[in-house]
């Protein structure tokens, strides 16, 4: 191709490639990405004493090894296996909380209900939450200018593959009754194309998971509809039931009151419905 001809004529070495960086459609690697990951790991292992055996430098090396010097549209789950191994953590049965399109409320909930865990409460999820990263083929550079967009560029990019990998693992290791928080304000309350719908649902293990309980979070104060009857929830029920996992659904009409009652369950107003 013409680009290769230019490289040949100029005798450009691969490690000099950053001058001709590929322009991706997505935003570039988060500023100070290596420092952020390392600092988050140190903080996590401090506040979670049971994870003190984790060597944060090794975690960063494994994280870096998953995407550095690799073409950022050709990342595989295999690339992240060394990192997954280092970050192995178990959640007690009945304590897994999945979520879809309602991350903030799910995290507010587990900050109060300390014995339940979202993926972002686990080491690997905590490290990567809200961050973007990618490298470049045959260079040790991190690309801070742009990274592949899932829709416009490719799905096998470092960030998407990471979340697919750790989400799969999180679902695979869940046991007992698994809970999922769903956003009742969206047109598709259950979206088959979300991480929950495309990865987690299909990786719950029927021999370990007795039931999936969906909490549908209502948006409007006056919204008294039974969103558990929504067609997409019925679709979720069908998928789960076919996998020999029982399905339950609850409407959370007042998310503000719901959180308040998690904080203060003895409050008299919490004895009525939320």
């Amino acid at each position: 191709s013409g680009l290769n001809d230019i490289f040949e004529a100029q005798k450009i070495e691969w490690h000099e490639l950053p001058r001709w960086r590929q322009q991706w459609s997505g935003s570039g690697t988060t500023s100070r990405f290596p420092e952020t990951v390392l600092a988050r790991c140190v903080k996590y292992t401090e506040v979670h004493p049971e994870m003190r055996h984790v060597d944060c430098q090794s975690v960063w090396d494994a994280f870096k090894g998953a995407f550095i010097s690799k073409y950022p549209c050709n990342i595989t789950e295999e690339d992240y296996q060394p990192l997954v191994k280092l970050g192995t953590q178990t959640v007690p049965c009945n304590k897994t909380l999945l979520w879809s399109r309602i991350k903030d409320l799910a995290h507010q909930f587990t900050q109060v209900q300390r014995d339940m865990f979202t993926l972002e409460d686990m080491l690997l999820g905590y490290l990567a939450d809200d961050l973007t990263w990618c490298g470049e083929f045959n260079t040790f550079e991190i690309n801070y200018q742009s990274c592949p967009d899932w829709r416009k560029d490719c799905s096998n990019n470092p960030v998407s593959v990471f979340w697919k990998t750790v989400s799969r693992r999180f679902a695979e290791t869940a046991c007992g009754v698994v809970h999922v928080m769903l956003n009742g304000s969206r047109s598709k309350i259950f979206d088959k194309n979300s991480t929950f719908g495309s990865v987690e649902v299909h990786n719950l293990q029927p021999e370990k998971v007795q039931a999936l309980e969906a909490w549908v979070i209502h948006g409007g104060r006056e919204d008294s509809r039974d969103l558990c009857q929504d067609p997409t929830i019925k679709e979720l029920e069908s998928i789960i039931s076919k996998r020999n996992i029982r399905f339950f659904c609850k409407n959370i009409y007042r998310p503000d009151k719901f959180l308040q009652c998690v904080k203060n369950p003895e409050d008299s107003s919490c004895l009525s419905g939320i």
């Epitope: 140190v42 903080k43 401090e46 506040v47 049971e50 003190r52 209900q113 300390r114 014995d115 998690v262």
Partner: antibody, heavy 115, light 113 residues
Framework: QSLEESGGGLVKPGASLTLTCKAS?????????MCWVRQAPGKGLEWISC???????TYYANWAKGRFTISRTSSTTVTLQMTSLTAADTATYFC?????????WGPGTLVTVSS | DIVMTQTPSSVEAAVGGTVTIKCQAS??????LAWYQQKPGQPPKVLIY???TLASGVPSRFKGSGSGTHFTLTISDLESADAATYYC???????????????FGGGTEVVVK
């Protein structure tokens, strides 16, 4: 592996005192929580402060903020500086810690505040 | 700071019997709870950590359970050597504002007849 406290004794109200906790058989090179806990005569245990040796971050009970200062002074010693002591501070002061939970305790050092 | 409420403050039981001590946290602490045994003139000794994990060298007669805000220590097949004061201890953190705290329950004196 063991811990030993020193620096206790009889002091007058309003005085200051520094207690030292020395680790034997291990060092604080990797992250662990080193804490001070006290016990007034015939009373229960009361948490004062902890330091995480991995980062140097310090944490205090609300009542202890301002008057107590925890520090790591070497790879094997942690100190607790106490100021404006009153009779209510009379207690056995324990140093405790470990990498996971407070599994290691010193024998304690008695601090008596009396005029 | 979190408040740990321990009950009863004192309990008496016969050798071979069973004692149950309860501890309630003022906030949900997950499973970050430890139980200690203290005998007069000695420092506390850890029995259980992370709510239910038996510390090294501790007999299986000691059992910890619970999660969130309610926890229990059960001592079965009581021996005279179990006469001591038992304390629960919580650990709490928030990652976002760099807050960590520890707290002890008021203690339970176990008298073995």
């Amino acid at each position: 592996q063991s811990l030993e406290e020193s620096g206790g004794g009889l002091v007058k109200p309003g005085a200051s005192l520094t207690l030292t906790c020395k680790a034997s058989g291990f060092s604080f090179s990797s992250g662990c929580d080193m804490c001070w806990v006290r016990q007034a005569p015939g009373k229960g245990l009361e948490w004062i402060s902890c330091i995480y040796t991995g980062s140097g971050s310090t944490y205090y009970a609300n009542w202890a903020k301002g008057r107590f200062t925890i520090s790591r002074t070497s790879s094997t010693t942690v100190t607790l500086q106490m100021t404006s002591l009153t009779a209510a501070d009379t207690a056995t002061y324990f140093c405790a810690g470990d990498s996971d939970y407070l599994g290691l305790w010193g024998p304690g050092t008695l601090v008596t505040v009396s005029s | 700071d979190i408040v740990m409420t321990q009950t009863p403050s004192s309990v008496e039981a016969a050798v071979g019997g069973t004692v149950t001590i309860k501890c309630q946290a003022s906030q949900n602490i997950g499973n970050y709870l430890a139980w200690y045994q203290q005998k007069p003139g000695q420092p506390p000794k850890v029995l259980i950590y992370r709510a239910s994990t038996l510390a090294s060298g501790v007999p299986s007669r000691f059992k910890g359970s619970g999660s969130g805000t309610h926890f229990t220590l059960t001592i079965s097949d009581l021996e005279s050597a179990d006469a001591a004061t038992y304390y629960c201890q919580s650990y709490y953190y928030t990652t976002d504002d760099n807050y960590r705290s520890w707290a002890f329950g008021g203690g339970t004196e176990v008298v073995v007849k």
